[in-house]
Amino acid sequence: MAFAPIPRITWEHREVHLVQFHEPDIYNYSALLLSEDKDTLYIGAREAVFAVNALNISEKQHEVYWKVSEDKKAKCAEKGKSKQTECLNYIRVLQPLSATSLYVCGTNAFQPACDHLNLTSFKFLGKNEDGKGRCPFDPAHSYTSVMVDGELYSGTSYNFLGSEPIISRNSSHSPLRTEYAIPWLNEPSFVFADVIRKSPDSPDGEDDRVYFFFTEVSVEYEFVFRVLIPRIARVCKGDQGGLRTLQKKWTSFLKARLICSRPDSGLVFNVLRDVFVLRSPGLKVPVFYALFTPQLNNVGLSAVCAYNLSTAEEVFSHGKYMQSTTVEQSHTKWVRYNGPVPKPRPGACIDSEARAANYTSSLNLPDKTLQFVKDHPLMDDSVTPIDNRPRLIKKDVNYTQIVVDRTQALDGTVYDVMFVSTDRGALHKAISLEHAVHIIEETQLFQDFEPVQTLLLSSKKGNRFVYAGSNSGVVQAPLAFCGKHGTCEDCVLARDPYCAWSPPTATCVALHQTESPSRGLIQEMSGDASVCPDKSKGSYRQHFFKHGGTAELKCSQKSNLARVFWKFQNGVLKAESPKYGLMGRKNLLIFNLSEGDSGVYQCLSEERVKNKTVFQVVAKHVLEVKVVPKPVVAPTLSVVQTEGSRIATKVLVASTQGSSPPTPAVQATSSGAITLPPKPAPTGTSCEPKIVINTVPQLHSEKTMYLKSSDNR
């Protein structure tokens, strides 16, 4: 599998409509919770919780602050922690408790605490529960949590130093936790937790499972340095611990290695960054997408692997266990256990088979089973990804978070659209197209290139959004920017399953937002732009330039996968000529203008899609170079594109040339702008109007020229 290509389109922060939320002096917007039925997004930040309109997050509905007292801050600082940063209250748990309340926990100056937030009054109830085991002490420590039927399942550290890891259930009738032992958890970095619903109420009483994902230090591989291993672990919701052995401890805790590697190159991705569980009506069993980086990541590599949950369940219910054996010098080695396995199977959830054998609860499991699972929490079998390979491998990027949406294209094909955020504040949108990865677009969510800490996807039909949280705020982005594709070719070449071209309105529309039937819409996920209607007429721009001056002709081709070149009077322009240059890889500069430069200039793009090359006329300019006579009285003028008053525009219609151009000579390269030749010496007097037109011509666009006096400061 090859590395994923660069994103086809890059949207700068200012180019697209992004909604933002941030409050002055509030940082670390890392906990996001969406209430789809209320159209409310809850945001947990440092010392604050906000409720905002999920359809427009800039609309704040409620806020509540949970600050640390000066006394607590001082005590925290005495223990060597920073009063300005660490000794504050970082909201780490934000979970639904009931229809009217949230369960909130914070680091609380290294004294983790939890409370209930009443959603009607938007006030804390002041319960001030001990958050130990539910929330980390240190804001820098890893954590994960999930609320299951009013009980909080968490993975975090249990002490001030963060040296005691714990996976626990906070429950009034049956609280449980992991053993504090290296075979169970060895310096884990918690990433994600979720419940997988079975059918506990069905006559077979299949227990719900809670899955935990983390990276930990390996016990089974021996190297000079510490090897990190990505893990999937699970516990059973119906677990009540053992009666004597494993009393108040999980009897169902099992863990296995997650494999994500590129078999052909020996490239192993062993640091888990994020996980997303994809549930869809079309999926019998959920699929989970996991985001990885290698342990030694000096080249900026990231990978996404997808797993069938049934693969993991198979490992836990039928796989072999690992066993620790003591070798010379009391050194421990982990090997496959091939001995007899007690019945009921260690770590198994209580099912109808166990009940039939009179094991109706974990409390009456035999000691042999409990002792075995206590000593053998690690499976020998690994959980392998779908197709035994990553869905995506990307170079020169550190991905941080992932969400996935399953959507149907016009032709009925189902695509899993991966939204992956980066440590530079960007969001990549990618799909698998015939065993290759296509990164549809990259959107710069955060202007100051800060890491995205949290990513959330709304699942409500109609208005669909991705929400991203960072240190400075939250950004809301639509799933697609279909309207930004100005032509049918652009819309088709985007190969975005959310977008289709509507010939009647001549716009690229979002499929899930069109109420009208999809009849007549054009979408070609192969990128075959020949399905687009013929453009016999295209608008062009007419410019008047001064003899001897320099002209810049704009060409707004957004595709990073396209090569741009220019034709003049149907001949391809030569790059080596001192006459021309490229600005910003796409715009044409013409130096030392003369009458011979008058004529039709076309900007064309060439883009390889699969095995085809698609040519497009992106912009057309008609240039006329004139010797401007001296005006009687005139200030120095320049014609520039500005927000000033409208003077004139000339948009004309011409036939588009249909011939395929030869290999381009002047073309954009990844190196950026071409060095400009020296400017010609100015001619004439200072009172001559210096006319420079800086337009942004585009097919079917109506960009306007404005006249502005340079005296107007």
Epitope: D149, G150, E151, S171, H173, S174, K198, S199, P200, D201, S202, P203, D204, G205, E206, D207, K237, G238, D239, Q240, I350, S352, R355, A356, T360, S361, S362, N364
Partner: antibody, heavy 121, light 112 residues
Framework: EVKLEESGGGLVQPGGSLSLSCAAS????????MSWVRQPPGKAPEWLGF??????????EYSASVKGRFTFSRDNSQSILFLHMNALRPEDSATYYC????????????WGQGTSVTVSS | DVLMTQTPLSLPVSLGDQASISCRSS???????????LEWYLQKPGQSPKLLIY???NRFSGVPDRFSGSGSGTDFTLKISRVEAEDLGIYYC?????????FGGGTKLEIK
């Protein structure tokens, strides 16, 4: 031997309240879901809902016909199941059965003998 | 709610004869886990219902092998190969795949 025995039935006026009990023996009560079923005279039984076991926090599931009016609870120390009925209507008149739901692939394996409730003015 | 319809309402038989009772559900009663939780109960006069068949065709412990269940999707059948006197009473089908669980209207097996 598994035994279930209902009690507390009788005559009650419309709008009134009544509580039924079901004493269980012969099995570990906390490990089982327990269900209530009623049967009006000469008609088919009607499932009213269940209360889950200890592993599932003794939470409840009700049928729409009784939701909001009837409440299930259990005294696990005494192995007794309760059905609290409020705002009773004439159509609630029936024989009320408690039954064990064992999660063994089938639903109601053991039933009590039933207790009769009549709602009439 | 899933409506369970039983036919016939009444089934007069001679002892030793075969009896067949039909039960039809208003929608598929295949559970999301793939199992079909269709059960048959027998209620004798003055007694509570007793479980005979579960998961369409499995006999509950102690149930004689003259009782058999079959069917799938929405159509199910209970057969008694040779009716005995102790088999008389009202038979109910019962679906426990979807909440609320629902009973059929009953079929009365009586002597001809």
């Amino acid at each position: 031997e598994v035994k279930l025995e209902e009690s507390g039935g009788g005559l009650v006026q419309p709008g009134g309240s009544l509580s039924l009990s079901c004493a269980a023996s012969g099995f570990t009560f906390t490990d089982y879901y327990m269900s209530w079923v009623r049967q009006p005279p000469g008609k088919a039984p009607e499932w009213l809902g269940f209360i889950r076991n200890r592993a599932y926090g003794y939470t409840t599931e009700y049928s729409a016909s009784v939701k909001g009016r009837f409440t299930f609870s259990r005294d696990n120390s005494q192995s007794i199941l309760f059905l609290h009925m409020n705002a009773l209507r004439p159509e609630d008149s029936a024989t009320y059965y408690c039954a064990r739901y064992p999660l063994l692939g089938y639903a109601l394996d053991y039933w009590g003998q039933g207790t009769s409730v009549t709602v009439s003015s | 709610d899933v409506l369970m319809t039983q036919t016939p309402l009444s089934l007069p038989v001679s002892l030793g004869d075969q009896a067949s009772i039909s039960c039809r559900s208003s929608q598929s009663i295949v559970h999301s886990n793939g199992n079909t939780y269709l059960e048959w109960y027998l209620q004798k006069p003055g007694q509570s219902p007793k479980l005979l068949i579960y998961k369409v065709s499995n006999r509950f412990s102690g149930v004689p092998d003259r009782f058999s269940g079959s069917g799938s999707g929405t159509d199910f059948t209970l057969k008694i190969s040779r009716v005995e006197a102790e088999d008389l009473g009202i038979y109910y089908c019962f679906q426990v795949s979807h909440v609320p669980w629902t009973f059929g209207g009953g079929t009365k097996l009586e002597i001809k």
